[in-house]
Interface confidence: medium
């Protein structure tokens, strides 16, 4: 018996097509993905083969101006509209909260959404029972499948699950479920989730009785052959781990931002034992043409969204210094801002402990494209901001060890004075130059702001220690040369859209005036 | 309110075909399954097919593959059954009703008035 | 094909009476079984989904239970709008037959 998984995972909000980088669509000959070309060959593929699931494994929240307007009603309508068949929670998903995630998603959705290692506990208990299930199991054509969920067990760091929500380590937590599904004859079974390929492959190895793991959080691109577009595969599709108890179990994720669609066929025999398993994502490029009522469903959709991008979001009653002559060479305001929304972006209150899990953010000067002038009346709109940040980025968290930080701040003034992107803006750092010294060593003093303490100061950093850090990207893919960041984080996160974290925290303050206040200095 | 509305009774001779339509309204129509069912006097009920109006993608119960086709208009929010070489048997009311997809669970919770289709010499 | 058998096929009552109908399925369905209430010359109406949930607006004397091939509708205590023919649903593989339906007639 023969079945077919497509799949998607880390959408964030790329309704429509996009460029081949994934930010906004400039020249439609040439850009990809969208919900409307993503039902043209999921509908192709449906009625061509007979056995098809069509799987999401988390993140479709937060990415673009459609979930800052529409804050998951899209999702539920676009992904209802395409008939996923499930979907499991990924951190993003909790983004505004848990209601943000019931009311828009949850309430609307007409396909399960799954997670087996998230417990509600306290009045949230009976709120949210039913709405999210641990498993569901699936009819296709004449046999059964098992789908069970599995979500990020670090997402209370990563987003705003609130109180009442227990995150479990996923496999103590799946094993169980899987145990009943095999109690229930169930003898087809996949795990869908969204942890980050390390945990999938762990979950393909111990997880007794998984036979298929799809996966996201991680981004991963897994392909068998030559690409077709710029990503380069971690590994081929499907990447297979040898499980514990000496199965052949094929783990998948499918990039992210929808431009590739994850195809695997699974063949399984009558014990439902996976006999082969074979597939790659198919790139949803311009060859593949936009559904035409999926596009005018969009098109309708984004009349909202265009209204939305000049209202007001706050004022500013100080001029908003974005522009290179300051950003690339000292301390700038609009770097200031923008670092102060990622922290409070992160505010997680950890325990008694720590007033928050992270304290630091650092900034690439070059990535501050726009000043915004408070003499039009003060007013700050979604337009102003995304000629501040027109690349369609966001802004996540690491944890790096003091020597990177450290190097990361000598890259930041290598080259001094050539008005090039890489000098940092900071946020809970004070740091001081000495640009007399050689390159490489021109970090005299470098500070950082405690999380482990009741009243926040600033200590030195210590190389050995390690840090968790807000940041672009775009700089924790090695961006701008900073290749010791991408070679040596230890864990990386991908966090909420650049312009929607800074225009969230202008509404939230309503009037803002970032001052230079001697974070970054020259001796 | 969210209602399916069919048109009137039929009568046709063996070997002839009928269409008949299925209006909706009260909801995004493009958004749930149509589905066919019919019922002889005095018999069951018997599903037939359905139709998922955003894109026309259908299925078919395969004792009916080949005489029924399932179409819809969805500028005017309408589902069409048209059933070609008419049989005696076939005399019947035909219901259409909405598929509610809520989270998987699937059931027909709004059924059209019914269309009683009679083949007679 | 997986086929639904009712039982019974018809059934006397009286007001105030529990009654229960059963429906067995050729295969395991996996709780995709509705239950839906016809009367004559109307359209069928929908009662329960699941084998167990109670759609909007039925009265709570309507319950289902069940599991594999096995399921039941059971109504606690009958009224006298609940006189009408039941049908249970699969919704499993299709074909999405129906149980050849149990008529509930005055006794």
């Known amino acids: 018996w023969e079945l077919t998984i497509l799949h998607t995972n880390d959408v964030h909000s790329r309704l429509e097509q996009t460029s081949e980088d994934s930010s906004k669509c400039v020249n439609a000959s040439r850009c990809m993905g969208g919900v409307a070309r993503l039902f043209t060959k999921v509908q192709q593929i449906r009625r061509a083969e007979p056995n098809v699931l069509l799987l999401d494994a988390g993140d479709q929240y937060q990415g673009t101006i459609w979930f800052t307007v529409y804050k998951g009603a899209e999702v539920a309508h676009f992904m209802n509209a395409l008939r996923y068949d499930a979907m499991a929670l990924g951190n993003h998903e909790f983004d505004n909260g848990v209601e943000g995630l019931i009311e828009p998603l949850l309430k609307e959705a007409k396909f399960p959404i799954l997670s087996a290692n998230i417990k509600a506990k306290g009045p949230l208990a009976s709120q949210i029972s039913g709405l999210y299930l641990p498993y569901k199991v699936l009819p296709v054509g004449d046999e059964v499948v098992g789908i069970v969920g599995y979500t990020s067990k670090e997402t209370p760091f990563l987003s705003n699950p609130g109180t009442n929500l227990v995150f479990e380590d996923e496999i103590t937590a799946l094993q169980p479920e899987v145990d009943k599904l095999k109690t229930l004859n169930v003898n087809k079974i996949i795990a869908l989730g969204h942890s980050g390929f390390e945990t999938d492959k762990l979950i393909a190895q111990k997880v007794r009785g998984v036979d298929v793991v799809v996966g996201g959080h991680s981004n991963t691109f897994l392909y068998t052959g030559n690409p077709p577009s710029k990503e380069v595969p971690a590994g081929k599709y499907p990447f297979i781990v040898t499980s514990d108890d000496g199965r052949k179990v094929p783990v998948v994720q499918a990039y992210a931002f929808g431009k590739y669609l994850g195809y695997l066929k699974i063949e399984f025999d009558e014990r439902g034992n996976v006999i082969s398993s074979h597939g790659n994502p198919i790139l949803l490029n311009s060859s593949i043409p936009e559904d035409p009522s999926i596009k005018a469903d969009i098109n309708k959709w984004r009349i909202k969204l265009d209204n939305y991008s000049t209202q007001e979001l706050g004022k500013t009653i100080v001029y908003l210094d974005g522009s290179s002559q300051s950003c690339r060479f000292r301390e700038c305001n609009m770097g200031n801002l923008i670092c102060d929304a990622m922290i409070n972006n992160n505010l997680r209150h950890a325990d008694e402990m720590f007033w928050n899990h992270v304290s630091m953010c650092i900034l690439n000067g070059g990535g501050i494209r726009s000043p915004i002038d408070e003499r039009n009346n003060g007013t700050i709109t979604w337009e102003n901001l995304a000629a501040v940040l027109p690349f369609g980025g966001t802004f996540d968290l690491v944890q790096l060890k003091g020597s990177t930080l450290k190097k990361a701040f000598e890259h930041s003034v290598h080259r001094y004075g050539q008005s090039t992107g890489e000098f940092l803006q900071v946020g809970g750092i004070h740091v001081v130059y000495d640009l007399s010294r050689k390159p490489g060593d021109r970090v005299v003093k470098l500070d950082v702001l405690c999380t482990k303490c009741r009243v926040p100061s600033y200590d030195p950093l210590k190389m050995d220690e390690i840090y968790k850090v807000i940041l672009p990207n775009f700089l924790a893919n090695g961006g701008d040369g900073f290749q010791m960041i991408k070679d040596e984080l230890l864990r990386h996160d991908s966090g909420d859209q650049d312009i929607n974290v800074v225009s969230t925290y202008i509404s939230k303050m309503k009037v803002i005036y970032p001052a230079v206040e001697g974070r970054i200095k020259f001796s | 309110q969210v209602q399916l509305v069919q048109s009137g009774a039929e009568v046709k001779k063996p070997g002839a075909s009928v269409k008949v339509s299925c209006k909706a309204s009260?909801?995004?129509?493009?958004?749930?399954?149509i589905n066919w069912v019919r019922q002889a006097t005095g018999q069951g009920l018997e599903w037939i097919g359905w139709?998922?109006?955003?894109?026309?993608?259908?299925k078919y119960n395969e004792k009916f593959k080949g005489r029924v086709t399932l179409t819809v208009n969805t500028s005017i929010s309408t589902a069409y059954m048209e059933l070609s070489s008419l049989r005696s048997e076939d005399t019947a009311v035909y219901y259409c009703?909405?598929?509610?997809?809520?989270?998987?669970?699937?059931?027909?919770?709004?059924w059209g008035q019914g269309t009683t289709v009679t083949v007679s010499s | 094909d997986i086929q639904m058998t009712q039982s019974p096929s018809s059934l006397s009552a009286s007001v105030g009476d529990r009654v229960t109908i059963t429906c067995r399925a050729s295969?395991?369905?996996?709780?995709?079984l509705a239950w839906y209430q016809q009367k004559p010359g109307k359209a069928p109406k929908l009662l329960l989904y699941?084998?167990?949930t109670l759609a909007s607006g039925v009265p709570s004397r309507f319950s289902g239970s069940g599991s594999g091939t096995d399921y039941t509708l059971t109504i606690s205590s009958l009224q006298p709008e609940d006189f009408a023919t039941y049908y249970c649903?699969?919704?499993?593989?299709?074909?999405?037959?129906f149980g050849g339906g149990t008529e509930l007639e005055i006794k």
């Open positions: 009703a909405r598929k509610e997809g809520y989270r998987g669970d699937w059931y027909f919770d709004v």
């Open positions: 009260g909801y995004t129509f493009t958004s749930y399954d």
């Open positions: 139709i998922y109006p955003r894109d026309g993608f259908t």
């Open positions: 295969g395991n369905v996996h709780n995709y």
């Open positions: 699941n084998a167990k």
């Open positions: 649903q699969h919704f499993w593989s299709t074909p999405w037959t």
